[in-house]
Interface confidence: low
């Protein structure tokens, strides 16, 4: 999906009002310096691409993020503020239902959500122009 035409300010508002707090709740009890940020993004569409990938694509050691509160709110925000996003997700959601596993908060999931926090921070902070 090409995130270029999303309403970034509305997504930012959704993040600041709710998604950020859900991410913090998920990470509660974890030190902010425990994980190094290894994933980054260069502009808002790129950030959303990375955020979608980390939030909804199961990875080795962490298959359970898609049903977390922050993930559902992320999905809702993208569906509302990114034209055509919902349609592209129908097939992906069908496939995910078939392989959903028991919800377990692993250290790998915590690391992945820490990366997500970093990506959201970058999304919310358009880079200053280089002078």
């Amino acid at each position: 999906y090409d995130f270029t035409n999303c309403d970034f300010e509305k997504i930012k508002a959704a993040y600041l009002s709710t998604i950020s707090k859900d991410l913090i709740t998920y990470m509660s009890g974890t030190k902010s310096t425990e994980f190094n940020n290894t994933v980054s993004c260069s502009n808002r569409p790129h950030c959303l691409t990375e955020i979608q990938s980390l939030t909804f694509n199961p990875t080795a050691g962490c298959a359970s993020l898609a049903k977390e509160m922050f993930a559902m709110k992320t999905k809702a925000a993208l569906a509302i503020w990114c034209p055509g996003y919902s349609e592209t997700q129908i097939n992906a959601t069908q496939a995910m239902k078939k392989r959903r596993k028991r919800k377990v908060t692993t250290n790998k999931c915590l690391e992945q959500v820490s990366q997500l926090q970093g990506l959201w921070r970058r999304f919310n902070r358009p880079l200053l122009k280089q002078q």
Partner: antibody
Framework: EVQLVQSGAEVKKPGASVKVSCKAS????????MNWVKQAPGQRLEWIGI????????SYNQKFKGRATLTVDKSASTAYMELSSLRSEDTAVYYC??????????????WGQGTTVTVSS | EIVLTQSPATLSLSPGERATLSCRAS?????MHWYQQKPGQAPRPWIY???NLASGVPARFSGSGSGTDYTLTISRLEPEDFAVYYC????????FGGGTKVEIK
Amino acid sequence: EVQLVQSGAEVKKPGASVKVSCKASGYTFTDDYMNWVKQAPGQRLEWIGIISPYNGGTSYNQKFKGRATLTVDKSASTAYMELSSLRSEDTAVYYCAREDYDYDGYAMDHWGQGTTVTVSS
Amino acid sequence: EIVLTQSPATLSLSPGERATLSCRASSSVSYMHWYQQKPGQAPRPWIYATSNLASGVPARFSGSGSGTDYTLTISRLEPEDFAVYYCQQWSSNRTFGGGTKVEIK
């Protein structure tokens, strides 16, 4: 624990330049902006400028544009503020201050201890 | 540039009294931050985004306001509250107010 440790006091002659450093630790240096703030003796806080360690992008207070230069060394997690063509009114304490967007606002949540720069002939 | 004007410049009060500090912006801002500074020390974040107390700040402090007018209130002054308080905005670059010194009467 987030810490910003600044370089020591400097005494400079008018017309010279000074470069103040600010070593960051306890967080991912490239995640947050770094501000520089001036405080002349008995005076208000005065914003100099801001830099994004992620890409080196900067924004300056018009008053300091052309004389202040903000840079970073990502590998050393260190921010720098260089002030050129010094004059007596540049005598002040200079602070670096990390800026984060906690509480839905971009606030300066951690400050260095300050570097005193004295300009005197 | 948005200019922030703090009043009064100096507030002379006794411990136990109520303190009201004002910060007025030359044009509307989204919200205001407040910092406390004591002699020889760096400023410390005190109130974030108009009304959120920074970590460790006592509940006797509160912040309010919108648009161009913002207020920091101390319900009952304690000896450790005597300091200079600065407001700061970032809606248009970053600017600080001139500060209000809260001193013991």
